[in-house]
């Protein structure tokens, strides 16, 4: 009779996480009598996976009925595979004794686990930034195996090139993580923009995972101000409006000053939304000219999203006849946008809500 051989026909087996792994093992003889054991790894630190003779192995089942006569198939199935199960598995024949002694080992089967990456999580800067600034976004995904993975960044469907990616750990591991940082230059039109991190992996069968960040969470578009004098509404009354244009987010507080004294403060509520996602708002002030002996300096002061206030002033000359003040030329407009942004007509306005 030829000496027993332990046959492990598969050098390697690859299994998706969550599935069962079948590890094949046959012996070529019924002699010697003794149990089969399965180990992960070799040497003194090897881990017992299954012992035919004794023990409780809830995740392991034998593929064939090992109690049946002349059974020489000692293949096992391991359920609910996780990346932690990766390794080389050895089918080992023991010889009956007190105790049973190791007789012969199979050549081993390497189990690799295909684990899907977690959904990419994209996070942006802690504080908002204004157009023309460069901001960093990070993307993280964990728990994937094998190590090979592809990560791409997009802004509104356009692929970005300014990013750095690391996959950890560098050496062998049961699973891996990816971390990438992309730099994005903000523009005034980015309120509706999205930054997308796309991860492609063998486990995803060509259907990449995506994580997104809305630039609306990151961008701050400061307003432009325009103060204008409207036609006379009534005898001795002048209507002065402050157009607050193209701002984001909506959080905005406006204060009217008459010769440096606070006249009224209001918070932007009913606003107009532009196609690009920014907002417009208009406030007006009725000035009783007869109450003023001298010229009046009217200032529209805006505090946007907790930032330092910006303002624009309008000088109202009270010496002129009230009826002449109906035109923009009747009173001298010496306002200046203290932020230095240019004033311009907004063609995107959908509608105007006037607040008194």
């Amino acid at each position: 009779e030829e000496e027993l051989q332990v046959i492990q026909p598969d050098k390697s087996v690859s299994v998706a996480a969550g599935e069962s792994a079948i590890l094949h093992c046959t012996v070529t003889s019924l002699i010697p009598v003794g149990p089969i054991q399965w180990f992960r790894g070799a040497g003194p630190a090897r881990e017992l996976i299954y012992n035919q003779k004794e023990g409780h192995f809830p995740r392991v089942t034998t593929v064939s009925e090992s109690t049946k006569r002349e059974n020489m198939d000692f293949s096992i199935s391991i359920s609910n595979i996780t990346p932690a199960d990766a390794g080389t598995y050895y089918c080992v024949k023991f010889r009956k004794g007190s105790p049973d002694t190791e007789f012969k080992s199979g050549a081993g089967t390497e189990l690799s686990v295909r684990a899907k990456p977690s959904a990419p999580v994209v996070s942006g800067p802690a504080a908002r930034a204004t157009p023309q600034h460069t901001v960093s976004f990070t993307c993280e995904s964990h728990g994937f195996s094998p190590r090979d993975i592809t990560l791409k960044w997009f802004k509104n469907g356009n692929e970005l090139s300014d990013f750095q990616t690391n996959v950890d750990p560098v050496g062998e591991s049961v699973s891996y993580s990816i971390h990438s940082t992309a730099k994005v230059v903000l523009t005034r039109e980015d309120v509706h923009s999205q930054v997308i991190c796309e991860v492609a992996h063998v486990t995803l069968q060509g259907d990449p995972l995506r994580g997104t960040a809305n630039l609306s969470e990151t961008i701050r578009v400061p307003p432009t101000l325009e103060v204008t004098q409207q036609p006379v509404r009534a005898e001795n009354q002048v209507n002065v409006t402050c157009q607050v244009r193209k701002f984001y987010p909506q959080r905005l507080q406006l204060t009217w000053l008459e010769n440096g004294n606070v006249s009224r403060t209001e918070t932007a509520s009913t606003v107009t939304e532009n196609k690009d996602g920014t907002y417009n708002w208009m406030s007006w002030l009725l000035v009783n000219v007869s109450a003023h002996r001298d010229d009046v300096k009217l200032t529209c002061q805006v505090e946007h999203d907790g930032q330092p206030a910006v303002s624009k002033s309008h000088d109202l000359k009270v010496s002129a006849h009230p009826k002449e003040q109906g035109s923009n030329t009747a009173a001298e407009n010496t306002g200046s946008n203290e932020r230095g942004s240019s004033d311009y007509k907004d063609d995107d306005d959908k509608h105007h809500h006037h607040h008194h």
Epitope: L30, I31, V33, G34, P35, E54, E65, T67, K68, K96
Partner: antibody, heavy 119, light 110 residues
Framework: QVQLVQSGAEVKKPGASVKVSCKAS????????INWVRQAPGQGLEWIAM????????HYNQIFKDRATLTTDTSTSTAYMELRSLRSDDTAVYYC????????????WGRGTLVTVSS | DIVLTQSPDSLAVSLGERATINCRAS??????????IFWYQQKPGQPPKLLIY???NRDSGVPDRFSGSGSGTDFTLTISSLQAEDVAVYYC????????FGQGTKLEIK
């Protein structure tokens, strides 16, 4: 180490039944067959039957097919052999034995249970 | 059913001498490349002990003075040099089909 501990001696009257137990330890009970063998005083060994505790598959010696019943309780790793309609020639030591190689052989034996059938 | 017949029924051998016990099957017990014969030793007041499995393979812990041979229908258990502790009854068993035992051979010291 493998151990098979059998129940104590029994004295029965003819026509009665006896149920002998065999508690296994030191191995996974459901992975190996249990055989039952008897030996009348001064006589040879006589195979009665065998059971696979994993699925209760049984094989009986034709001589005992109508009178013997093998069962197992996997929760306690115990095998049972019941013999009915006892006669005086059923007086014997009854052994349980474990088949370690699935060869229909008897590798490890209990110490035996003496059943005496006498009126 | 396969019937096993042992010979002799009893045997007396001097210490240090060879003891040979035969077992003949009523039909071949060879199957799948194996001879399905087993040998047991039973000492007084003890359960049997497996000595040889599949005709020629010593069980663990069995001294190498015990050996088994044979094929098909004729099998032999040999004790190469009899020791005092070898006094016992020896049984052959087959499992080509459902198990049966031979009637036993009583081995004594001459």
């Amino acid at each position: 180490q493998v151990q098979l501990v059998q129940s104590g001696a029994e004295v029965k009257k003819p026509g009665a039944s006896v149920k002998v137990s065999c508690k296994a330890s030191g191995y996974t009970f459901t992975n190996y067959w249990i055989n039952w063998v008897r030996q009348a005083p001064g006589q040879g060994l006589e195979w009665i039957a065998m059971i696979d505790p994993s699925d209760s598959e049984t094989h009986y010696n034709q001589i005992f097919k109508d009178r013997a019943t093998l069962t197992t309780d996997t929760s306690t790793s115990t095998a049972y052999m019941e013999l009915r309609s006892l006669r005086s020639d059923d007086t014997a030591v009854y052994y349980c034995a474990m088949d370690y190689g699935s060869l229909y052989a008897m590798d490890y034996w209990g110490r035996g249970t003496l059943v005496t059938v006498s009126s | 059913d396969i019937v096993l017949t042992q010979s002799p029924d009893s045997l007396a051998v001097s210490l240090g001498e060879r003891a040979t016990i035969n077992c003949r099957a009523s039909q071949s017990v060879r199957s799948s490349g194996y001879n399905w014969i087993f040998w047991y030793q039973q000492k007084p007041g003890q359960p049997p002990k497996l000595l040889i499995y599949l005709a020629s393979n010593r069980d663990s812990g069995v001294p190498d003075r015990f050996s088994g041979s044979g094929s098909g229908t004729d099998f032999t258990l040999t004790i190469s040099s009899l020791q005092a502790e070898d006094v016992a009854v020896y049984y052959c068993q087959h499992s080509r089909e459902l198990p049966t035992f031979g009637q036993g051979t009583k081995l004594e010291i001459k």
